[in-house]
Interface confidence: medium
């Protein structure tokens, strides 16, 4: 299907590419001595980039700092120094640049202020950083300003004094709506959820916090939970971990109505040293990690039903080091239903696993064609691909980038990996899949930085090296053939690749610095590939592809979550522009239902290798500890529930007698007396 990658051979040689790229390579040298650079894109398809350079000298008592702000409006080909727009103020890099949602054009920079000042200072822009307004704050911010996803004029921030501050006019005026706030988040419809401590402090009251909600930006409040440890939002679900009455364990409760009613999630409770983590969530379901007791470094992934209440065990021994630590869990955004993560074996080796059906079944990644099994493999002919992700990066392995996929580059996944029985500490190579992870091929020897341009029409890579570099590699056929382009005669110490988020652009910026005896000078090279892909793609450049196809003889071939999708994909041999307006063309078709389209409802489970759901023996004839909507209630079930997001129709309907599961509600989490409504007078 695809051969081993070739570099600079006659394989798909592009005529005059050096001349075409030389004419479209733009250098910008930054005239300052900064130690660090941060870059942000402002808006979508605007071409606007902001670059903040900072230089800090820690002196004995205070630190001296200087910032410079640069702006490009042509995707990084040219930059203009706009430091004067922020009055040459030193910007606090830990707050970054707060870029507004969607195409609002809003930017907030948080400035450093002198010790005795009453509050902080921000610079605000609502015109894609053409102009900035200086605003002095009535508080010192603890966190970056958070924009409401629904209205970019609404902002919230926490102060160093744990006050919750809200602005309704893009930071011009601020009001403290609550004190003693530990964590605050925007929910849907401009709702703010936050936890407050009642007695001492956020840390001391962990597990005794209250969860509050305001739907009117702080005019009125409702306490929606007590004995809270923490809370989180994922998809349409609001989660809270709640302390148990009897001991120091805590349990997850879930709400789908912004906290008006709660149900106890059917997940194991966790102790003080353990944690829950929402790995991924959408409008249909959630992936939840539950940490194992003890300092094991692993836990279990559970997937939820459509209510977020009933959970199926998805993957055992899932690698997740500590709270807020490292997990390799990756959503492969280029193909629906695909996720990759790592498990920790009994022998402490780390192995990659992939699911193609949203966590229903996990398997090892198929060994790339024509690849040899490395030293980790017991059997030199049978092994699998193991992907390096966050954990490897945290362990300082020679892995410059996490796996990469883009929704509009259908089926493409690029990642560092090794071929064996487990992840290897040896120098990894770069592998590519063009079918969403079903099959893999080695793309590049050794570690590289990589990015996807023009919705997959071009892949760009730069070798990861300690030495200065001046070569960029690119492929127009999904990583099969590679051309090398020398973008500068003066090699630079490479620090990063920057391309506009969304992978629609044809521009790539190569960032780095040159170093002389005493000075370091930042430089960027922006390469525009528009003349490599000189014509627009036409109908004949695309071919149909059935996603998830593994068995063309099977009537359910390609069916994932009850439907299959045929995509129009660019032929590997076509060298043309998808273009900025490219929309992924797909034709979905509904599949007939089979038992694979159903999960087991509360009180039921699937025996190993079985299709049917059966009653859990330990629950037969018992009152079930189950709490739905915070009150005792009869739960009727036939043992099956359609998998969240599954669209199958007809076929098999697992109808059988409906059982009435009598149960007692053991959650006093929502004691009605606690559900006060308060007004902010």
């Amino acid at each position: 299907r695809r051969g081993a990658p070739a570099e600079d051979q006659d394989c798909g040689r592009l005529p005059d590419f050096i001349a075409k790229l030389t004419n479209n390579t733009h250098q910008h040298v930054f005239d300052d001595l900064s130690g660090s650079v941060s870059l942000s894109w402002v808006g979508d398809s605007t071409g606007v980039i902001l670059v903040l350079t900072t230089f800090q000298v820690p002196l004995v008592i205070v630190s001296f700092g200087q910032s410079k702000l640069y702006r490009s409006e042509d995707y990084g080909k040219n930059f203009k120094d706009i430091t004067n727009l922020i009055n040459n103020t030193f910007i606090r890099t830990e707050f970054g640049m707060a870029i507004g949602p969607e195409n609002s054009g809003k930017v907030i920079l948080t400035a450093e202020v002198s010790g005795g000042s009453r509050g902080g200072r921000v610079f605000r822009s609502s015109d894609f950083a053409k102009n900035f307004v200086q605003t002095d704050l009535p508080f010192h911010p603890l966190t970056q300003m958070m924009y409401s996803p629904q209205n970019s004029d609404y902002l919230l921030a926490l102060s160093t004094e744990n006050g919750l501050w809200v602005s309704k006019n893009f930071g011009e005026k601020w009001e403290e709506i609550h004190k003693a706030v530990c964590l605050a988040k925007w929910g849907p419809n401009n709702i703010i959820f936050f936890t407050t401590h009642v007695n001492g402090s956020c840390k001391a009251d962990l597990g005794a916090l209250e969860l509050w909600r305001t739907s009117d930006l702080g005019k009125t409040f409702k306490t929606i939970g007590v004995k809270i440890y923490s809370f989180g939002l994922g998809g349409r679900f609001l989660f809270a971990s709640v302390m148990a009455d009897k001991d120091t364990t805590r349990r997850i409760h879930v709400s789908t109505d912004q906290g008006d009613t709660w149900s106890m999630a059917q997940l194991p409770s966790v102790g003080q040293e353990q944690f829950y983590s929402i790995l991924a969530a959408n409008e249909d379901m959630v992936f939840m990690h539950v940490d194992e007791p003890g300092d094991t470094g692993f836990g279990t992934i559970f997937t939820s039903d459509d209510r977020g209440i009933v959970y199926s065990k998805s993957l055992d021994r899932h690698l997740y080091t500590t709270t807020g630590g490292e997990t390799d869990f990756t959503n492969v955004t280029s193909l629906r239903g695909v996720y990759i993560t790592s498990t920790l074996s009994e022998d402490n080796s780390i192995q990659s696993m992939i699911t193609f059906d949203q966590g229903g079944r996990w398997e090892h990644l198929r060994k790339p064609e024509n690849s040899k099994c490395d030293a980790t493999a017991k059997n030199k002919n049978e092994c699998s691909l193991h992907i390096h992700a966050s954990y490897s990066i945290s362990q300082k392995l020679n892995v410059p980038m996490a796996p990469l996929s883009e929704p509009n580059a259908v089926g493409i996944v690029i990642a560092h990996g090794s071929v064996g029985d487990a992840i290897s500490v040896m120098v990894p190579d770069v592998y590519i899949s063009d079918d969403g992870g079903y099959s893999w091929a080695k793309m590049l020897e050794g570690p590289h930085y990589y990015t996807i341009l023009d919705s997959g029409g071009i892949i760009v890579a730069i070798e990861h090296s300690n030495r200065p570099i001046n070569v960029i590699k690119f492929s127009t056929d999904e990583g099969q053939c590679w051309q090398s382009y020398v973008f500068t005669q003066e090699p630079i110490y490479f620090t990063g690749l920057a391309s506009e988020p969304g992978a629609r652009s044809m521009n790539i910026s190569i960032w780095g610095f040159t170093e002389s005896f005493i000075t370091r000078q930042w430089v960027s090279y922006t390469v525009d590939f528009k003349d490599i892909l000189e014509r627009n793609c036409e109908e004949d450049d695309y071919t149909t592809w059935l996603a998830h196809s593994t068995d063309p003889g099977d009537y359910k071939d390609g069916c994932i979550l009850g439907y299959k999708e045929q995509f129009l994909r660019l032929r590997k041999s076509s060298v043309c522009q998808n273009g900025r307006d490219y929309v992924v063309a797909k034709q979905p078709s509904v599949c007939p239902c089979s038992l694979e389209d159903f999960l087991c409802d509360f009180g039921y489970f699937r025996p190993e290798n079985a299709s049917e759901c059966v009653e859990q023996p330990e629950l037969k004839g018992h009152e079930l500890e189950f709490c739905l909507y915070g009150k005792e209630e009869h739960l009727t079930t036939n043992g099956y529930r359609k998998i969240p997001g599954d669209k199958c129709q007809g076929g098999m309907n697992p109808a059988r007698e409906v059982k009435d599961l009598k149960k007692k509600c053991t959650s006093n989490f929502l004691n009605p007396t606690k559900q006060n409504s308060k007004s902010n007078s």
């Epitope: 003889g553 099977d554 089979s594 038992l595 025996p607 290798n609 299709s611 049917e612």
Partner: antibody
Framework: QVQLQESGPGLVKPSETLSLTCAVS?????????WGWIRQPPGKGLEWIGS???????YYNPSLKSRVTISVDTSKNQFSLKLSSVTAADTAVYYC??????????????WGQGTLVTVSS | EIVLTQSPGTLSLSPGERATLSCRAS???????LAWYQQKPGQAPRLLIY???SRATGIPDRFSGSGSGTDFTLTISRLEPEDFAVYYC??????????FGGGTKVEIK
Amino acid sequence: QVQLQESGPGLVKPSETLSLTCAVSGYSISSGYYWGWIRQPPGKGLEWIGSIYHSGNTYYNPSLKSRVTISVDTSKNQFSLKLSSVTAADTAVYYCARGPPELGKMYFQHWGQGTLVTVSS
Amino acid sequence: EIVLTQSPGTLSLSPGERATLSCRASQSVSSSYLAWYQQKPGQAPRLLIYGASSRATGIPDRFSGSGSGTDFTLTISRLEPEDFAVYYCQQHGRLPPWTFGGGTKVEIK
């Protein structure tokens, strides 16, 4: 070793209901697996009638669905077939059989020896 | 429903010869979902092959299955006297009905 044994009347009158039971030994029905009925008219080929899982989920041949009921009795470790409104065309050797617990693997590894049922007045 | 047609209806061969039995489906069947059975007079069928090519427990390796899509084959590499019987194919996919072919009789020439 799992063994299956069909039992029931060898002669049934037309329009009446054919009732057969399959007794399972050497394996607990409630431990999983699909349990099925297959028939073979004299000198002819095999026809799948239906299958049941121990939890009670049933799957029937559409051509017989309106007349067939398969049920399971886990306490007696047996499952049963009822075929109503029989005609001479229902004369066949009736086999009970066991298949794996996975749909998509509805082949039959273990069979009873079969029982001949004749429909005649 | 998927109709399975077996050919030939009767195959006359001598012991030691190679037997090739065909099973054709009216629509595509996944190779994962085709089985073969052997039935001798007065006996229940016996499972030989499932998943088109996997031998059932205790089946000698002279029996092999192959094929995909609509065409499947059961091969008996060297016929033994006890192999003369009727052979049925069956599709066992994820949705009912699960159907059998009409059978091929392998008789002694």
